[in-house]
Each structure stands twice: as C-alpha cells, then as structure tokens.
C-alpha cells in the first residue's frame, strides 16, 4: 500500500490517515463516516461518461 505523498490510491480506493493505508470506497456504504470517504466523494471510482455538447 502507498505511503501518503507518493502515488495515489488505485481507482475505487482512498487514503485513510486513521488506518494509514488505502481503503475501499465501496465500504463507505456501510461506514460513511470513515475519514477516507471524503476522498471517495471527491474522486468517483468510475470515469464519467461525457455528454455530447
């Protein structure tokens, strides 16, 4: 697992300072108050489908 300040967590995960490791954003459904869930909200796990102009 990455240390903070190096490469970001993989897609679908976010860094937890509390646990000192990358954590699954999917777990925020069960534990929405986890520290890393804020990072999940800011970076959706799947790319957006671009709308036609």
């Amino acid at each position: 697992e990455q240390a903070p300040g190096t490469a970001p967590c993989s897609r679908g995960s976010s860094w937890s300072a509390d646990l000192d490791k990358c954590m699954d954003c999917a777990s925020c459904r069960a534990r929405p108050h986890s520290d890393f869930c804020l990072g999940c909200a800011a970076a959706p796990p799947a790319p957006f489908r671009l709308l036609w102009p």
């Epitope: 679908g12 509390d18 646990l19 699954d24 954003c25 999917a26 069960a30 534990r31 959706p44």
Partner: antibody, heavy 119, light 111 residues
C-alpha cells in the same frame, strides 16, 4: 504481519456452554468489525455474529439461528474478542473461525477451532 | 435472507484451461456503482482466503489469473490459466445486508 489466534473449542454436551477467544495482532484492531463464521458439512460456511467498532457503538448482530444463545464481545485494550455460546445443540457442531472486516468482506481469518456438541 | 446459489458444485478443468464458477443471488446486491459480492478460496485444513472483493477487485497478492465480473444478481469467478495450486473449494459471499450469506461452494479439481 496480521494474525488472528483462536482458542477454545472441543467437546461439549448438549445444553452445555463454551467460550471462544480470538487475539488479534498486526492491524488497527479497534477500527475493525469482528465476526465469527462457522463451517459444517451440512450447512457450509455460515456467518454467526458480528461486533462493530466503538465508532459504531459496539453494535452487535447475530444470525437468527443463534440469537439468544450466543453473545459476541470485544476488548479493544487487549485486541481480543469472544464468542460465548450457551445451550449448545448438535447443529452447532462445526469449525468456528474468527474474522475481521472493515466492512463487507472477511479479510483476515483465524486458524479455526473445532466445536463438537455430543453426548 | 439473500440466498446464494453457486454452480457447478464441482468442476474438473485441464491444466492451463479456464475455470468458470457462477454465483446467483436471490436479490440484487449492487448499487449503481458497486456490487457487494466477494469470492474466497479454501484449501483443506485452512480458513478461506479472500480473492476478489466487490465483484471484480483483485485482492492484493492474488494472481491476475483470477478475475471476477457481474452485477445485480449474477456473478462469475474466472481462473485462467488454471494451475495445480488452484485445487480448492471456492465460495461467493454477499455483504448487501445482514445476515451475510455464502454460496454452497464449488470444488475445483485440476486434470
């Protein structure tokens, strides 16, 4: 290195009691939810009970088949948790595993301990 | 309770070929973003070992020969190419709600 070390188990008569213990090391125990999962040839893998973390008010959940019979508890200061089993019956026979989960999947597992309920 | 139905119950696959194991949940275990389905491998005398989480996310340290797919009620575990060491029983598990339930297992034999 993560370890879940189990103790307890053995042979107990129907109607009897048994307490299983699990000591954790190598991860932030207090942040994790802890479960007991049992396995038997008849029922396969069966989730039994869960105790959540302090931030979740140590909420407990049980399989319907063990409600009122089993009690799960934890001691964060010593990184250990327990399963107190009362009024045991033959259908409670199996291998009992302790396991940790942050949420959703069972990440780390103990080595398993055998419980036999028989006269 | 959500019932997990795994097929087949047993499977024999030649070395180097593909093994496909299916798991069907009695109701959807997916949101628009994630599927709450997980796969484990168990060898005799050992506890289960996590392989795949959230339907398709490979657990750290698990070989890329293992892959998972599916959403809603239907999920698949693929192993390709299979190796001798893959002889084991494989289980699916949902975490959509309590009680968490497991499939009945698929015993994989390598020919």
């Amino acid at each position: 290195q993560v370890q879940l070390q189990q103790s307890g188990g053995g042979l107990v008569q129907p109607g009897g009691s048994m307490k299983l213990s699990c000591i954790a090391s190598g991860f932030t125990f207090s942040s994790y939810w802890m479960s007991w999962v049992r396995q038997s040839p008849e029922k396969g893998l069966e989730w039994v009970a869960e105790i959540r973390s302090k931030s979740d008010n140590y909420a407990t959940h049980y399989a319907e088949s063990v409600k009122g019979k089993f009690t799960i508890s934890r001691d964060d200061s010593k990184s250990r948790f327990f399963l107190q089993m009362n009024n045991l019956r033959a259908e409670d026979t199996g291998i009992y595993y302790c396991s940790s989960t942050y949420a959703d999947y069972f990440h780390y597992w103990g080595q398993g301990t055998d419980l036999t309920v028989s006269s | 309770d959500i019932v997990m139905t795994q097929t087949p119950a047993s499977l024999a696959v030649s070395l180097g070929q593909r093994a496909t194991i299916s798991c069907r949940a009695s109701q959807s275990v997916s949101t628009s973003t994630y599927s709450y389905m997980h796969w484990y491998q168990q060898k005799p005398g050992q506890p289960p070992k996590l392989l795949i989480k959230y339907a398709s996310s490979l657990e750290s340290g698990v070989p890329a020969r293992f892959s998972g797919s599916g959403s809603g009620t239907d999920f698949t575990l693929n192993i390709h190419p299979v190796e001798e060491d893959d002889t084991a029983t494989y289980y699916c598990q949902h975490s959509w709600e309590i009680p968490y339930t497991f499939g009945g297992g698929t015993k994989l034999e390598i020919k």
